[in-house]
Structures are given as C-alpha cells and as structure tokens.
C-alpha cells in the first residue's frame, strides 16, 4: 500500500469559449481508494478555488460552466490525488480558453453536381459554421476541411478550404456514389468531429477534369 501516483491533466476543451472542461489521468492508486480534487486560480488572483462541477464531463474531469469561464484570464490548475497513505499533485497547468476551442461540426452540408454548358462539370459543396460559434466578434477565425470518397473506396481525398464555406471539386469518377464530410477548427484550436456524411451520385456523363 502506497501513496497515489502523480496524476496528469492532459486535455482541456471548450465548444465555444463560453464553457470548458479539463480531464486528468490518474496515476497509480497505491492499492487504496483514492480521492481526486482539482483546484485552480486565475491570473492575478491568489485565492484558490475547487472545481465547480466534477459530474458534467464524466469521470476524472472538471467542467467550468458559463459563470466560471473567462476568456480574459489564464487559469492555473492542478489535481491532488489523496489516499490513506498520502497525497500527490499533478504539475501545474495553464489554460487560456482561446486556445482550447474544439467546435461542433459544421452544419447544413449541401452537395450538388453542377454541369454548366460552357465549362467543365463540378461538385459544389456548401455548409454553415456551427451554431455555438460567434464569428461576428472577429477573433474567431474558422478553417474548414472537406473529405470525400467513392462509397466503396478505402481512402479519403482531403481538401483544405481555408475560411470559405463553399468549395468546388472538379476531379470525380463518373457513375460513382460519393460520401462527403466537412469539419472545422479555429486557428489555434482543435478540429471538430466530421459532420454526418452526405451522399451524392455522380452522373455517368460527368466529364473527368484533365
């Protein structure tokens, strides 16, 4: 029977900069029941606070609701593991909410085959940013990535779309059914999950781009 091993806070994420959650990995339990507590203070403060919500994020997590989340202040936090034999602390972790945003996937993915008379046909893909992300404030720049593949293919073809919310793809295999998905990330945050797949049938007379 030993004191607990050192825990590690390894992940913090915010869906929209208004709330966030951090998760820790327990160290060894020393063969005894172990309690974990997360304490934090914010830059410019000395007063330590305990995690406001250990439930929402699941096991070994701390969730900071709206009233506990500030974009203006860096959070300094650590996890304490305690059993009957003693305690151990994680390293201090510094968190700036701006840099942990992982948005929801983009919405309203629409895919259409366009066959203009005077130009080569193309696949037109359009989507909307996730609802929770407020792009009007200006500090939030979302970047998008598209992936597509014929239904039975193993490999995805990836296209980086930058900040635009629509994209054209010229090179496609005629007569194939394609799956299309899109995801997004802020400049310094994390990629969202891929959006649900949209299927599109490419006509047999679709001319491949040279």
């Amino acid at each position: 029977q030993l004191p607990p091993g050192k825990p590690e806070i390894f992940k913090c994420r915010s869906p929209n900069k208004e709330t966030f959650t951090c998760w820790w990995r327990p160290g060894t339990d020393g063969g005894l029941p172990t309690n974990y507590s997360l304490t934090y203070h914010r830059e410019g403060e000395t007063l330590m606070h305990e995690c406001p919500d250990y439930i929402t994020g699941g096991p070994n997590s701390c969730h900071f609701g709206k009233q506990y989340t500030s974009m203006w202040r860096t959070y300094i936090m650590m996890v304490n593991a305690t059993n009957q034999m003693g305690s151990s602390f994680s390293d201090e972790l510094y968190v700036d909410v701006t840099y942990i945003v992982q948005p929801d996937p983009p919405l309203e993915l629409a895919v259409e085959v366009k066959q203009p008379e005077d130009r080569k046909p193309y696949l037109w893909i359009k989507w909307s940013p996730p609802t929770l992300i407020d792009l009007k404030t200006g500090w939030f720049t979302l970047l998008y990535e598209i992936r597509l593949k014929p239904e039975k293919a193993a490999e995805w073809e990836i296209h980086f779309a930058g900040q635009q919310t629509e994209f054209k793809i010229l090179s496609l295999h005629p007569g194939q059914k394609y799956l299309v998905q899109v995801r997004c990330k802020p400049d310094h945050g994390y990629w969202s999950a891929w959006s649900p797949a949209t299927f599109i049938q490419i006509p047999s007379d679709f001319t491949m781009n040279d």
Epitope: C12, R25, E43, M71, W72, Y94, W139, K185, Y190
Partner: antibody, heavy 118, light 112 residues
Framework: QVQLVQSGAEVKKPGSSVKVSCKAS????????IHWVRQAPGQGLEWMGE????????NYNQKFKGRVTITADKSTSTAYMELSSLRSEDTAVYYC???????????WGQGTLVTVSS | DVVMTQTPLSLSVTPGQPASISCRSS???????????LHWYLQKPGQSPQLLIY???NRFSGVPDRFSGSGSGTDFTLKISRVEAEDVGVYFC?????????FGGGTKVEIK
Amino acid sequence: QVQLVQSGAEVKKPGSSVKVSCKASGYTFTSYWIHWVRQAPGQGLEWMGEIDPSDSYTNYNQKFKGRVTITADKSTSTAYMELSSLRSEDTAVYYCARSFFTNWFAYWGQGTLVTVSS
Amino acid sequence: DVVMTQTPLSLSVTPGQPASISCRSSQSLVHSNGNTYLHWYLQKPGQSPQLLIYKVSNRFSGVPDRFSGSGSGTDFTLKISRVEAEDVGVYFCSQSTHVPFTFGGGTKVEIK
C-alpha cells in the same frame, strides 16, 4: 518532469538540408503544441513555426515557408524540424519549445547548433 | 510582421539596485479576444531561454517576486526591484498576439 531533448550539433554544406529532432517526455505528447525557434550567433530569437502533435496541423512563419517542414511522430513522442536549401545565414542554435494550452513557451529544449559552411 | 524594439541594449547594475527594460511593439498587441500576449524571457549564459512573465504582468511559476511586468498597447516594461547575481543574462520580450510570433533584440544585463 517535462523534458525536451534535442539531437546533437550538425555541420552542413550550403544547399543541403538538416533535420533536428526533439524528444518529449514527462507529459502526454499529443496534448500541447511544439514550436521551433532559432537564434543566430549573438542574435535574437526567431520563431519558425509550430505543430499540434495530435493531428500534425502546422503553422509556419512565412519567412521560412517552403524551406521548413515541421513533423511529429506520436509513436516516439518526437517532433522534427527540417530546413532545406541551407545557406550560411541559417547557422544558428535551433530550439524546440512547448506551450501549455496557451501561446507562450513554458519549456525549452537544450538547443541544437547547426553550422552551415562550405 | 510585428517589430519588437527593446531598450537599452545592455545594462550594468549594482547588486541590490533596480533595473528596468523597455519594449515597444510596432503595432498594438491587444488580441481581438481582449488579451495582450506580451511575454518576457530570460536567457542565462549558456542556457536556453526561460519564461519569466506571461501576458504583460503575470509571473510564471517559480519566478521571484522581484520581477514585475507592466504596460499596455504598444509600450511595455520589465522591472527587477533588486538585481541579484543570478539575474545576469539576456532578457527578451516576445509577442504572440500576431502570427508570426516575434521577439525583441534582447537586453544584456550584467552585474557591476
């Protein structure tokens, strides 16, 4: 404890490439961005670029765009910085540095001296 | 790119005396999220840089309270209230509001 251990000094010919490694330990490698910063002899610091090891997403200083490639190998917890078309002005100490969930550098490697000379 | 200009270039200080280093940026360092990402690093002789101050005025873990940072917008200052022998080295200001991140040219602090 957190450690960033870099590969040893290199001497390279102009026009060649160099690849510097940065092995991370003491934390979950995929959690935090790794940055590369260089320092020419007797000079200031110059940020070259960064990588998110979780998905290898990179941002580069446009000054080095096309010449620098930053990669990460999750299986060995190692980040790499490759600089091509070397010239004498690339003679410098190259540092890797780690952020938290922030955009400043809390931990630094010991530095790797790259000398470009014919 | 944002140009960071440090003054003075070098500083010779008697132990126990104060020291002050100025850093000026070519454009505002206020991020669109409201934060100011101006930091100070110290590079001791033969060592890698180490973080002293983040976001203008916040001391990093383990940094003695004789170090303090202040300023806003484009003008920033690092102060050492009482210089000690272990404070010798080159001090760099750095901004991470705008990409690419940039550093000042450095201020060398020596002991008289």
